[in-house]
C-alpha cells in the first residue's frame, strides 16, 4: 500500500529502531530499522513480493532506470508509471534521467557525456550544475557563483552526504540514492552489509531512503543463518559471488 514506507538507508546501517520520524506523503517518514516496512500501528514486515517497480519520479528508480508510463517514453503520461530500463546512446529521450549513466539528453537524443569532450557552451544548465558542483554551495561573497565552462571541465565528484542527481555525480565507491525528498551520495555496500533485494518486484516507490547496491564481486543474497526464517523476515546481505 502507498501508505507504507520502506526505510532502507546506508545512512542508518544497523541502528535499532526508532530513529525518530515526521510526516510524509505518501505514508509517514518513520525511521525504523533498515529494510523494514512500517504499516501504521506496530506492524513491521519486509517487502519482497510486489509487482514491477511503481514510481512517481526518476529518483525512485535504479541508476539504470527512469520512471515512465510503460506505453510511452515520457513520465507523466496518464496511468501507472513504473521504472523502465534507461535509454542507450543515440536513443530518443526527453530528459537526462532517461539516458543511461555516462550519457545525457541533448536535442532529444542520448549522447555520451564524456566530461573532457564538452564543447564550450554546449552542456545544458543542469549538467553544468552537476559538473561544476555548484549545487553544493553559495559563493563566498553572498552571491551564487556559476561554473565557467571551458573546453575541458575538471570537477570534484560528490563525497558521501553530497546532493547528487545520478551516481556519476558521486565519487568512486558511492552511488546516488534517494534520501527523503533529495538524493545524496551514499557508500556502495561492502561484504556483510545489509542490502535490499527488490527482485524486480517493486518497493522503490515506497522508499524514503535507498541503499546503494553491493560492491564489485558481491551479490545481495539471503543471509545463510536466516534461511529458516519466514519469507517476510529474510535478511539480505552483500556476499561474495
Amino acid at each position: 500500500t502507498l501508505n507504507s514506507v520502506l526505510i532502507n538507508s546506508n545512512a542508518i546501517k544497523n541502528l535499532p529502531p526508532p530513529l525518530g520520524g515526521a510526516g510524509g506523503q505518501p505514508g509517514s517518514a518513520v525511521s525504523v530499522a533498515p529494510g523494514v516496512l512500517y504499516e501504521g500501528g506496530n506492524k513491521y514486515q519486509t517487502l519482497d513480493n510486489y509487482q514491477p517497480y511503481p514510481c512517481a519520479e526518476d529518483e525512485e528508480c535504479g541508476s539504470d532506470e527512469y520512471c515512465s508510463s510503460p506505453s510511452r517514453g515520457a513520465a507523466g503520461v496518464g496511468g501507472v508509471q513504473i521504472c523502465l530500463a534507461c535509454r542507450k546512446r543515440r536513443k530518443r529521450c526527453m530528459r537526462h534521467a532517461m539516458c543511461c549513466p555516462g550519457n545525457y539528453c541533448k536535442n532529444g537524443i542520448c549522447m555520451p557525456s564524456d566530461h573532457s569532450h564538452f564543447p564550450r557552451g554546449e552542456i545544458e544548465e543542469s549538467i553544468i550544475e552537476n559538473l561544476g558542483n555548484d549545487h553544493n554551495a553559495a559563493a563566498g561573497d553572498g552571491y551564487p557563483r556559476r561554473t565557467t565552462l571551458t573546453s575541458k571541465i575538471y570537477h570534484t565528484k560528490g563525497q558521501e552526504g553530497s546532493v547528487c542527481l545520478r551516481s556519476s555525480d558521486c565519487a568512486a565507491g558511492l552511488c546516488c540514492a534517494r534520501h527523503f525528498w533529495s538524493k545524496i551520495c551514499k557508500p556502495v555496500l561492502k561484504e556483510g552489509q545489509v542490502c535490499t533485494k527488490h527482485k524486480r518486484k517493486g518497493s522503490h516507490g515506497l522508499e524514503i531512503f535507498q541503499r546503494c547496491y553491493c560492491g564489485e564481486g558481491l551479490a545481495c543474497r539471503i543471509q545463510k543463518d536466516h534461511h529458516q526464517a519466514s519469507n517476510s523476515s529474510r535478511l539480505h546481505t552483500c556476499q561474495r559471488h
Epitope: A11, G24, E129, H135, S182
Partner: antibody, heavy 115, light 108 residues
Amino acid sequence: QVQLVESGGGLVQPGGSLRLSCAASGFTFNNYGMTWVRQAPGKGLEWVSGISGSGSYTYYADSVKGRFTISRDNSKNTLYLQMNSLRAEDTAVYYCARTIYMDYWGQGTLVTVSS
Amino acid sequence: DIVLTQSPATLSLSPGERATLSCRASQNLFSPYLAWYQQKPGQAPRLLIYGASNRATGVPARFSGSGSGTDFTLTISSLEPEDFAVYYCQQYLTLPLTFGQGTKVEIK
C-alpha cells in the same frame, strides 16, 4: 545564478490562512527537492517541510502537520506553502531553500500571527 | 528526534584568532550527514559545510568541518571581520531535520 524569492508573508489573525510562494530561477527546478525552514524572532532555525523534485513526496514537521501543505508547480518554477489554522507560535521569517542541506536560501518572508 | 547541542553558546574572539565550534548529536549519526551554516543579522543563512567536511563552493579555505558519530567541529583558522556571526549545525540523517541552537561568534 540561482535565486529564490519568497513572497506572501504578512499579518494574519490566529486561525487564519496564508499562502507563501517561492519563485526559483537559475537552475533546473524539477531536479531538486525543496525545503521550507522558519525562524521565530530572535530564535534559531526550525525545519518545516520538504518536497521532492516531482512533488510526489512531501514531509512535515510535527508542529505543522495537518495545518500546512507544501506543493510546487514545476511549470512555473514555484514552490508553495499553504498555511492554515495559524497560531501565534507560527510567527517567524519563512525561508525557502534548495535540497535537504540548504545550499541556496531565499531572503525570507515574515509571517506574523497576532490578534 | 536527534538533538544537536552547540557549544559554546557565545565565543568572544579577536580577528586573527582561531575559532572552534562544537556540535554534539544526541544519537550517533553513523554517516556524515551534517551541515554548517553562517547567519548574519537580517540575512538568510548561508551554507558553509555539507557532508560534515565538504566546503561549499566559494567558502574560504579558513573554514573547515570535521568529526563523525556524535561529535562534529567547525573550525575557522583565522577570524576575519566578516566572520563574526551566528553559526548553526544541521543533521539530515533522519526526520525531523534538526538544527543546533547556534553559536554566536562575537568580537572580543
